[in-house]
């Protein structure tokens, strides 16, 4: 069994300084560990590259909304 206590923690220390086209994005996940210094989002691109982004930025929030929308048809 994996040792959860010693599991590695992924943190973001710097954010991308340019907006990424949603067409290049495949998924995202939040950094939820309290061990990390910054609140962050990690986008995974269609070529499997991972990019740290600032969740306070509107384009990041809009991109997450766009990706969510692909998983289910919304009732607006």
């Amino acid at each position: 069994q994996p040792d959860a206590i010693n599991a590695p923690v992924t943190c973001c220390y710097n954010f991308t300084n340019r907006k990424i086209s949603v067409q290049r994005l495949a998924s995202y996940r939040r950094i939820t560990s309290s061990k990390c210094p910054k609140e962050a989002v990690i986008f995974k691109t269609i070529v499997a590259k991972e990019i740290c982004a600032d969740p306070k930025q509107k384009w990041v929030q809009d991109s997450m909304d766009h990706l969510d929308k692909q998983t289910q048809t919304p009732k607006t």
Partner: nanobody, 123 residues
Framework: EVQLVESGGGLVQAGDSLRLSCAAS????????MGWFRQAPGKEREFVAA????????YYADSVKGRFTCSRDNAKDTVYLQMNKLKPEDTAVYYC????????????????WGQGTQVTVSS
């Protein structure tokens, strides 16, 4: 960490309305998709509704479409669930949740949960 506190539950009659609130603190509220789930005794936790970060898109379980409305106020760090035409089968503990991964109706994509508020609908 995100802290979520639900309120507004109670005992009502079938056909009545209730409005649940969920107050968030601790992180940037507008950066989280917010969801509502419910769990009745002896049943699994089920998706009820969710709302996008902007508030422009809402998502509903088939069982509540046309009766429940999910909304949010990013200035107040609060999400709401307006429940109309309540039915006895809506009786459950209702939980507010904040997203951690891509998705909408899968509870596994929500990383933060409130303690829940009881809603009881009598016939």
């Amino acid at each position: 960490e995100v802290q979520l506190v639900e309120s507004g539950g109670g005992l009502v009659q079938a056909g009545d309305s209730l409005r649940l609130s969920c107050a968030a603190s601790g992180r940037t509220f507008s950066s989280y998709r917010m969801g509502w789930f419910r769990q009745a005794p002896g049943k699994e936790r089920e998706f009820v509704a969710a709302i996008s970060r902007s508030g422009a898109s809402a998502y509903y379980a088939d069982s509540v479409k046309g009766r429940f409305t999910c909304s949010r106020d990013n200035a107040k760090d609060t999400v709401y669930l307006q429940m109309n035409k309540l039915k006895p089968e809506d009786t459950a503990v209702y939980y507010c949740a904040a997203s951690s991964r891509m998705g909408v109706d899968d509870p596994e994509t929500y990383g933060y949960w409130g303690q829940g508020t009881q809603v009881t609908v009598s016939s």
